[in-house]
């Protein structure tokens, strides 16, 4: 039997994926559970199998269609159910009505590249992935740069309060190795949260020019 305190949290990537995590204190690790999604105004429904990610939590991705297809809109409500197998039948463990565009978490930005690098500055660009056209320009970004001898957690956050898919890093040290990451967040949504950080982009500033002999 499954009992104890439970949590059921899902996010929509704004296109064709709903990712869910179900946690249950006292649940058996080998319990077979799934998430079932029923939109209120669509002909389709979808199921995914919850797989263990830790001692008491399971996760799965509801794949609603092709990665860039717009499967849900701002007016959709999706009823999400957690079902766990008990003997020969499925038992409903939780029911949640979910407004996709109130629960957004986009995919991490991709295609990071150095556009131009100098001794003290570096221009970097990136792209957003699988983001709805509904946002138009209503996105913001956070970026961070890893300096030698520091950790990511120590890196100051740079905030871009508009849809700007590039940044010019300044006051860098010449001939130094850095790493850079960026994440994205739509402006709308009661529970909307930051995307995961992008894969780090490594770059090196150019050496300072040698002084000329007199």
């Amino acid at each position: 039997a499954v009992n104890g305190t439970s949590q059921f949290t899902c996010f929509y990537n704004s296109r064709a994926n709903i990712s869910c995590v179900w946690s249950q204190d006292g649940a058996l690790q080998d319990t077979s559970c799934q998430v079932h999604a029923w939109p209120d105004r669509r002909r389709w429904n979808q199921t995914c199998e919850l797989l263990p990610v830790s001692q008491a939590s399971w996760a799965c991705n509801l794949i609603l269609g092709a990665p860039d297809s717009q499967k849900l809109t701002t007016v959709d409500i999706v009823t999400l159910r957690v079902l766990c197998r008990e003997g020969v039948r499925w038992r409903v463990m939780a029911i949640q009505d979910f407004k996709p565009f109130e629960n957004l978490r986009l995919m991490a930005p991709i295609s990071l590249q150095v556009v131009h690098v100098e001794t003290h500055r570096c221009n970097i660009s990136w792209e957003i992935s699988q983001a709805s056209h509904y946002f138009e320009r209503h996105l913001e970004f956070e970026a961070r740069t890893l300096s030698p001898g520091h950790t990511w957690e120590e890196a100051p956050l740079l905030t871009l309060k508009q849809k700007q898919e590039w940044i010019c890093l300044e006051t860098l040290t010449p001939d130094t190795q850095y790493e850079f990451q960026v994440r994205v967040k739509p402006l709308q949504g009661e529970f909307t949260t930051w995307s995961p950080w992008s894969q780090p982009l490594a770059f090196r500033t150019k050496p300072a020019a040698l002084g000329k002999d007199t």
Epitope: T5, S6, Q7, F8, T9, A94, Q96, D97, F98, K99, E102, N103, G189, E190, F191
Partner: nanobody, 127 residues
């Protein structure tokens, strides 16, 4: 703080529908998570549904089996409970409640999580 008044209860035949309303006054409605509970004669108060401040997530008791829909209209300071395919076992006094603390909409809240309660409205389902 808000005051809550439920309405919309009554007598309905099994298989029928009712829509309960809970009107809030005297506070900032959008700063409260809202819930519905019910209490049948001789039984404990039972959770029915709870919705977050903006309505982005709503949790339902498994016993509702997808027959109930809870929604809120922050412009009208009202939360609703639409009950379809009603059964005799749905007979109870239905209470609206407000929670001042933050509610994520990812778990089943306890009645003790709610600070403010309405006076209740009777729902009777006949067979």
């Amino acid at each position: 703080e808000v005051q809550l008044v439920e309405s919309g209860g009554g007598l309905v035949q099994a298989g029928g529908s009712l829509r309960l309303s809970c009107a809030a006054s005297g506070g900032t409605f959008s700063s409260y998570a809202m819930g519905w509970f019910r209490q049948a004669p001789g039984k404990e108060r039972e959770f029915v549904a709870a919705t977050t401040r903006g309505g982005g997530r709503t949790m339902y008791a498994v016993s509702t089996e997808g027959r109930f829909t809870c929604s809120r209209d922050n412009a009208k300071n009202t939360v609703y409970l639409l009950m379809n395919s009603l059964k005799p076992e749905d007979t109870a006094v239905y209470y609206c409640a407000a929670m001042t603390s933050y509610y994520s909409g990812t778990y089943y809240p306890d009645s003790s999580d709610f600070d403010i309660w309405g006076q209740g409205t009777q729902v009777t389902v006949s067979s």
